[in-house]
């Protein structure tokens, strides 16, 4: 059941998001989530994961990229990018000339 909280050993992760009460948190895994909301610049949030491990396997889109790892402070220096959007008139691999 993907919604069930993990009961394995906990790992310490860097916590950098509006929900953090301090610089680290403890969870089943560490996360970095890069999110771009409509009309805003992307925000990169670091924290802990305990639920929905399936999100870790999601492919990056132009709006979200979800990264997970399983070791001590492994999310600290991770930097993510969003999937680039391809204008409909251009094909990948062309230089527009």
């Amino acid at each position: 059941d993907p919604v069930k909280p993990s009961r394995g050993p906990l790992v310490t992760c860097t916590c950098e998001s509006p929900h953090c009460k301090g610089p680290t948190c403890r969870g089943a895994w560490c996360t970095v989530v890069l999110v771009r909301e409509e009309g805003r610049h992307p925000q990169e949030h670091r924290g802990c994961g305990n639920l929905h491990r399936e999100l870790c396997r999601g492919r990056p889109t132009e709006f979200v990229n979800h990264y997970c790892c399983d070791s001590h402070l492994c999310n600290h220096n991770v930097s993510l990018v969003l999937e680039a959007t391809q204008p409909p008139s251009e094909q990948p691999g062309t230089d527009g000339q």
């Epitope: 916590c15 950098e16 610089p23 949030h45 930097s79």
Partner: nanobody, 125 residues
């Protein structure tokens, strides 16, 4: 509500030093606290920032070696030590705070959710 209060600005002679402080209240933790400055008629420029989780400071190239950012964890206060000041350092210095950190945007004003009112620094020749 969150408040950032800067202090320590003033008038100093070229070659002198100042130490600015920024005290945060209304929230216990920020991921990043930074300093920006704005000279009359110019854009607001990045000075430096400190990442709270590891205490690593990042600086604008032109400030490296002269300016140092540090923090007091217990008081949610960040400091900007400015040495070898020059007349072109004259500006209003702003403290800024963000609930997150990004390697690609820590030097941009848009990453910061909260701003202080600013403190005037004037360097005379």
């Amino acid at each position: 509500q969150v408040q950032l209060v800067e202090s320590g600005g003033g008038l100093v002679q070229a070659g002198g030093s100042l130490r600015l402080s920024c005290a945060a209240s209304g929230r216990t933790f920020f991921a990043t606290m930074g300093w920006f400055r704005q000279a009359p008629g110019k854009e607001r420029d990045f000075v430096g920032a400190i990442r709270w989780s590891d205490g690593v400071a990042y600086y604008a190239d032109s400030m490296k070696g002269r300016f140092t950012i540090s923090r007091d964890n217990a008081k949610s206060t960040v400091f900007l030590q400015m040495n070898s000041l020059r007349p072109d350092d004259t500006a209003v210095y702003y403290c800024a705070a963000s609930t997150y950190f990004s390697f690609t945007t820590y030097y941009t004003a848009r990453m910061y959710d909260y701003w202080g009112q600013g403190t005037q620094v004037t360097v005379s020749s």
